[in-house]
Interface confidence: medium
């Protein structure tokens, strides 16, 4: 499984990711159990975060991992939990935030110099899939899809942002994780009020690039809380 690969330090030796832009299905998006995706303004945020159930890390966002919410808890009840920052304890790579990996039980910085920042996502615009596109094999050995192309380029399937080339991050698209461009100044970003609220979202945006942060656009300050437009702006 992917988890077993993430558990090892072989993460840096991944074969070229699968290629692919994921699609964005239908207007009405819902998550069982009974969660309806918010409609209306496409820059809405979700105020009331509901824990997102999961079975594998790949079903969570790129800044989350799948685990039992309580230490030693029932393994059958797992949710997406916020990733662990540098120097925090870990058991596998997926537990560490983008740009870090698990080494000797501690999250440490990846060798590659990748952009920092939270993964930005959009609620109603598109789909992201856990794109495991691995027909039951370890990612180290066999990738079953026919969509091989150069490692890390835009559209390639990825596990973490460190799998993508510079200027790209790994974000969900129609239930697949693919390399997408890091956001530039002026581009729309998504700022979640609650960590992990992306559990209800299909498509993710990348985070803002170096020297930029996701802030409310100045002329949108008067807008209602739910429709404030955020863009990448200089610090």
């Amino acid at each position: 499984t992917l988890n077993s690969v993430l558990n090892s330090n072989a993460i840096k030796n991944l074969p070229p990711p699968l290629g692919g832009a994921a699609g964005h299905p239908g207007s009405a998006v819902s998550a069982a159990p009974g969660i309806l995706y918010p409609g209306g303004n496409k820059y809405q945020t979700i105020d009331n975060y509901q824990p997102y159930p999961c079975a594998e890390d790949e079903e969570c966002g790129t800044d989350e991992y799948c685990a039992s919410p309580t230490r030693g808890g029932d393994a059958g009840v797992q949710i997406c939990l916020a990733c662990r920052k540098r120097r925090k304890r870990c058991m596998r790579h997926a537990m560490c935030c983008p740009g870090n990996y698990c080494k000797n039980g501690i999250c440490v910085s990846s060798d590659q110099n990748h952009f920092r920042g939270e993964i930005e996502e959009t609620i109603t615009e598109s789909f992201g899939n856990d794109h495991s596109t691995l027909d039951g094999y370890s990612r180290r050995t066999t990738l079953s899809s026919k969509m091989y192309h150069t490692k890390g380029q835009e559209g390639s399937v990825c596990l973490r942002s460190s799998d993508c080339a510079s200027g790209l991050c790994c974000a969900r698209h129609f239930w697949s994780k693919i390399c997408k461009p890091v956001l530039k100044e002026g581009q729309v970003c998504t700022k979640h009020r609650r960590k992990g609220s992306h559990g209800l979202e299909i498509f993710q945006r990348c985070y803002c690039g170096e020297g930029l942060s996701c802030r409310i656009q100045k002329d949108h300050h008067q807008a209602s809380n739910s429709s404030r437009l955020h863009t990448c702006q200089r610090h």
Partner: antibody, heavy 116, light 107 residues
Framework: EVQLLESGGGLVQPGGSLRLSCAAS????????MMWVRQAPGKGLEWVGA????????AYADSVKGRFTISRDNSKNTLYLQMNSLRAEDTAVYYC?????????WGQGTLVTVSS | DIQMTQSPSSLSASVGDRVTITCRAS??????FNWYQQKPGKAPKLLIY???FLYSGVPSRFSGSGSGTDFTLTISSLQPEDFATYYC?????????FGQGTKVEIK
């Protein structure tokens, strides 16, 4: 070899119901999102909806929202499309397809005719 | 919904001809864009994904280009088996939408 085989199509009266099935083989079904796409006679392709790998999430086109339900049984490698309150404009060949970075494998399609 | 406008709706060409089909989206779809080929009575087949990447097994005479709103499918030298209907599709926004199709016929 990857194969998708739809079944369950046929003639149904307006307002009626039908359940389509799509039997998958040759790949690890539970690793892929799946979609339904339809094509009215002599017309183009229309996306119907999609379902996430574990069936936790679904999405639908406005034209079928509230009437159609997509589900999957990963233990049986089968995708379903439950169609209720059928209308004449739902007449089409219905295809199930596997999603990767595009719809890379399609079934042969099953014809649904809604007519009185 | 994003509207996909394909042109031309049909064209006649000869074997060996260079054929270009264009597709315009009503708003930007980045590069999350696919091309499909469909022959009468058959299911569509994926040709190009992510705007320009050739799907495995597809002959190299097919190529895709474009980003944003304008995309192109080119067949460098038309072969007898290429006479079919071609559809573009965006996968950047919900719902996934297709162009109306371009039928490539024998001149």
């Amino acid at each position: 070899e990857v194969q998708l085989l739809e079944s369950g199509g046929g003639l149904v009266q307006p307002g009626g119901s039908l359940r389509l099935s799509c039997a998958a083989s040759g790949f690890t079904f539970n690793k892929y999102p799946m979609m339904w796409v339809r094509q009215a006679p002599g017309k183009g392709l229309e996306w119907v909806g999609a379902i996430q790998q574990r069936g936790l999430k679904t999405a639908y086109a406005d034209s079928v929202k509230g009437r159609f339900t997509i589900s999957r049984d990963n233990s049986k490698n089968t995708l379903y499309l439950q169609m209720n309150s059928l209308r004449a404009e739902d007449t089409a060949v219905y295809y199930c397809a596997r999603w990767t970075s595009g719809l890379d494998y399609w079934g042969q399609g099953t014809l649904v005719t809604v007519s009185s | 919904d994003i509207q996909m406008t394909q042109s031309p709706s049909s064209l006649s060409a000869s074997v060996g001809d260079r054929v270009t089909i264009t597709c315009r989206a009503s708003q930007s779809v980045d590069r999350y864009f696919n091309w499909y080929q469909q022959k009468p009575g058959k299911a569509p087949k994926l040709l190009i994904y992510s705007a320009s990447f050739l799907y495995s097994g597809v002959p190299s005479r097919f190529s895709g280009s474009g980003s944003g709103t304008d995309f192109t499918l080119t067949i460098s030298s038309l072969q007898p088996e290429d006479f079919a209907t071609y559809y573009c599709s965006q996968s950047t926004h919900v719902p996934l939408t297709f162009g109306q199709g371009t039928k490539v016929e024998i001149k």
